[in-house]
Interface confidence: low
């Protein structure tokens, strides 16, 4: 079973998936659609790196631009380094300014 077939089988269960499952899924060439991504638990999405989200969404990663003001994308952006977000070429704004030392990412959630 290839990645896309596997994704179709588990799609309906993904809403409550933990971060570990999403990280594993990102390695399987699943090309998750934006509608599914937007239904994921915010706390599960937040720890994902830019590279992991890029792999998870595949060609659908461009959809992050249209969803940048909505959760969980908005909250995820706030936790990423702007340098890393810039590598996507989508013009996503709101990441941690380049050069800032990140002391406690959980603090950002309280401030946002």
């Amino acid at each position: 079973m290839n990645g896309s077939e596997y994704f179709v089988k588990i799609q309906s269960f993904l809403g409550g998936a933990p971060t570990e499952d999403l990280k594993a899924l990102s390695q399987q060439n699943v090309s998750m659609d934006l509608a599914t991504f937007m239904k994921l638990r915010t706390d599960a999405v937040l720890p994902l790196t830019v590279a992991e989200v890029q792999k998870l969404l595949g060609p659908h990663v461009e959809g992050l631009k249209a969803e940048e003001r909505h959760r969980p994308v908005r909250d995820w952006i706030l936790r990423q380094r702007q340098d890393d977000l810039d590598t996507l070429g989508l013009g996503l704004q709101g990441g941690i300014p380049n050069g800032y030392l990140v002391l406690d990412l959980s603090m950002q959630e309280a401030l946002s």
């Epitope: 896309s4 090309s31 595949g58 631009k65 249209a66 989508l90 013009g91």
Partner: antibody
Framework: QLQLQESGPGLVKPSETLSLTCTVS??????????WGWIRQPPGKGLEWIGS???????FYSPSLKSRLNIAVDTSKKQFSLKLSSVTAADTAVYYC????????????WGQGTLVTVSS | EIVMTQSPATLSVSPGERATLSCRAS??????LAWYLQKPGQAPRLLIY???TRATGIPARFSGSGSGTEFTLTISSLQSEDFAVYYC???????????FGQGTKLEIK
């Protein structure tokens, strides 16, 4: 009803810059749901993706053309543009502008195309 | 770059008969494949996307199938307006690097 209309010179000299504009009517160029793209087709040949631009200005280019290419958007004029520098006869083609949903890389609506010939 | 190869280059079929066009990708494109129809002097028109979903206004005689690297466009009963050139296109790459097949010309037998 959405309409895409390409415009620009039909003849460009070798080594010069090819400049085309696509005007969007009957729809919003500022929609967050779409990218706006350029595709070309040399006479009697197949289709080649050139690049795409989002209303924010974020653009993506074909790797083979990237060094010579600039695609920009002017939302106030409801237009997006293509500039291809240092052209040769190999750049002679019908150039199409098209709409692309942000969720995928397909092109769901096309302009009628404009032929650009590179010749001295 | 993902190379898309279409076969045959030309297909001769009689009106009312079934036509089967093939498209092969040099590596997996998942289900991110589209088909377009182009008539002489006209822009391409989107027929199928996501391998098997018909675009708005496309008749049910057009159907798509496949996944990964092998894809098929089937026209169940050819009408006179279906004779044209058909292109497949993959959109499974990031950053975007969309590639088209070289086309299959469907002609009247």
């Amino acid at each position: 009803q959405l309409q895409l209309q390409e415009s620009g010179p039909g003849l460009v000299k070798p080594s010069e810059t090819l400049s085309l504009t696509c005007t969007v009517s009957g729809g919003s160029i500022s929609s967050s749901s779409y990218y706006w793209g350029w595709i070309r087709q040399p006479p009697g040949k197949g289709l080649e993706w050139i690049g795409s631009v989002y209303y924010s200005g974020s653009a993506f280019y074909s790797p083979s053309l990237k060094s010579r290419l600039n695609i920009a958007v002017d939302t106030s004029k409801k237009q997006f543009s293509l500039k291809l520098s240092s052209v040769t006869a190999a750049d002679t083609a019908v150039y199409y502008c098209a709409r692309r949903p942000y969720k995928s890389g397909l092109f769901d609506f096309w302009g009628q195309g404009t032929l650009v010939t590179v010749s001295s | 770059e993902i190379v898309m190869t279409q076969s045959p280059a030309t297909l001769s079929v009689s009106p009312g008969e079934r036509a089967t066009l093939s498209c092969r990708a040099s590596q997996s494109v998942s289900s991110n494949l589209a088909w377009y129809l182009q008539k002489p002097g006209q822009a391409p028109r989107l027929l199928i996307y996501g391998t098997s979903t018909r675009a708005t206004g496309i008749p049910a005689r057009f159907s798509g199938s496949g996944s990964g690297t092998e894809f098929t466009l089937t026209i169940s009963s050819l009408q006179s307006e279906d004779f044209a050139v058909y292109y497949c296109q993959q959109y499974n790459t990031w950053p975007p690097e969309y590639t088209f097949g070289q086309g299959t010309k469907l002609e009247i037998k």
